[in-house]
Every structure is written in C-alpha cells, then in structure tokens.
Amino acid sequence: ELCDDDPPEIPHATFKAMAYKEGTMLNCECKRGFRRIKSGSLYMLCTGNSSHSSWDNQCQCTSSATRNTTKQVTPQPEEQKERKTTEMQSPMQPVDQASLPGHCREPPPWENEATERIYHFVVGQMVYYQCVQGYRALHRGPAESVCKMTHGKTRWTQPQLICTGEMETSQFPGEEKPQASPEGRPESETSCLVTTTDFQIQTEMAATMETSIFTTEYQ
C-alpha cells in the first residue's frame, strides 16, 4: 500500500530513508536537457524475496537533442561499491536497515539523473530527519517519521524535532544529544502525495532542503 502523503514538513529540516521497503517506487527523472528514452521505464521498483531485495527496471536518460544516445542506469559493481561508501549509516541504528530483509538500499545514480529524487513510499517506511546547515536540533524523541495505516488511511507519525537557528549542524539521524523538549505537534495532515528528496543529501549531509514538492525552485 502506497502512502498517500509526504512525510511531515519540519522547518529547516530535510529527511531521507536509510533503506526502502519493498514496493517503494522511484521516478525515473532526467536532468534538464535530457529525457527518458522513448520506451523507458517511468519508475524503479524495490522488489525481492525474503532473502534479497533489489531495484527492478532501469532508468535511462538520453539527450533531448540526440535521439539515439542512451545512458546506462546501473554502474559496474566496482563503481557501485565506490558510490556506496558515500552513503550515511546511522549510528543510532543497531541494524543496518539496508541489509534488512524486504528493504532496498539507495539506488545507484544513473547518468544524467535529475538532482532530486521522487519516491513513492509504502506503509511501514521510516524516514529520518536532520536540520539543515546552520540549524541545531532540539528533540525530545526520535527524529523520525513512519508511514502507518490507521482505519484504512495512511498517515505519517510526527517527528519530535525542532531546528533552531544556531550555527551548529546535527548529524543524520539524531546524533545530536537531546535538548529541550518541544511540544509534539499534531499528526501530519499534509496533502503532498509524492516525496522528492534532494539527492545531494545522500552524499552531502549539510545540503539545504530543496524538496520539489514543497518548493517550486527545482523540482
């Protein structure tokens, strides 16, 4: 079951998933000046069995000017391994979520991919929040949100995170020591239905949040 809404918006914070549940879909988006190949997939799909999950379909971008040049999505194993070293692993998580059954790792980049990724999350997905550069985290509980099914409707739990304007950054997710306890806000009732996360945050944790659904600067 796909989550109806986006994870909650937290001022001066961005979110990411450490791993993606089976059923998650990722739009195949190309950067400006490039487009999907004519019969190319619209989405990548996290799929698998009890022991192994992986992304199905390939995203391929071609120059808008050149009709027959296609760009391969999947890097060679060596290249893939190298890129994986830039991924953040959470010191707060006892288990490497990306190794959990039923979860996929962050998909490797494809050539001429758009700068933001648009995910369609499924029930049970967890995302972690981090204050953007120049803001400091104050939180009472986990800086995370989970998509839950309640009475036939999906909703995201509200992360207990407030980002204050001090020139200090917290790490992903919630490495900052808990500070003052903000009042929890009501559960999210946002109407955004698709999540776009700035792909740069996977390698540059201090990146500014530029979520295309939330702002029109990108997408």
Epitope: E29, L42, S212, Q219
Partner: nanobody, 126 residues
Framework: QVQLVESGGGLVQAGGSLRLSCAAS????????MGWFRQAPGKEREFVAA????????RYGDSVKGRFTISRGNAKNTVFLQMNSLKPEDTAVYYC???????????????????WGQGTQVTVSS
Amino acid sequence: QVQLVESGGGLVQAGGSLRLSCAASGIPFDNYAMGWFRQAPGKEREFVAARDLEGIITRYGDSVKGRFTISRGNAKNTVFLQMNSLKPEDTAVYYCAARDGGVVAGSRSSAQYNYWGQGTQVTVSS
C-alpha cells in the same frame, strides 16, 4: 506540437456529478503522467489527481479523495476525471496537465508538469 484539450465542464448542483475529459496529442512518449489541477479565483493552483497512462501509480488530492476518480480512456492519450458528490468548494477552472515522467503529486507539484491545457470551468451551485 503538444496539445491538451479539456471538455466536460459546466454548471451542476451540489451533490451532482460531472465527467471531465482531456485529450492529448503530440506527446512523443510511450508512457507519461497526466494530471488534473484546479484553480479557484484568488487561490493557488491545487493538485486534484494524477496517474500514469499504464495505471502504475494513481494519486489524489486530499480534498477530492473518495469522490473523484481519474481514469484512462480507450484511446491511450485520453484521461477522464469523474467527479461525484460535488460541493460548492469544488468550483474552479480545471486544467489538464502532462509530464514526461512518472506521477508527481501534491500541493506544489504543478511546476513539474510541462504541458497544460486551457482549462474548463466547473461551477457547483448550492
């Protein structure tokens, strides 16, 4: 040249139904997302519904969930918006939109759609 042509708008009483249609031509892709947005006077453009032509993903705005249905016609390049249990607050100009890519939905997703129709007026009287 890409063209999106909406039809089916009109005046209807609250509780009634309307069916909007959108015919696309000139889109050079085998599969793409088509959506509906609406804009009431003095308000921002609002996401209503979207789907890709293969029906892999379908999305609805919160205010229309359970009342509106987006579907594809027999002609691959046609989508419909079936609007039931209409309310006065549904009054707006309804725009059809398309994009080369998967579904993008949500309150500010209109920037992601690069092809737009001229719109069709829907008025719901109380």
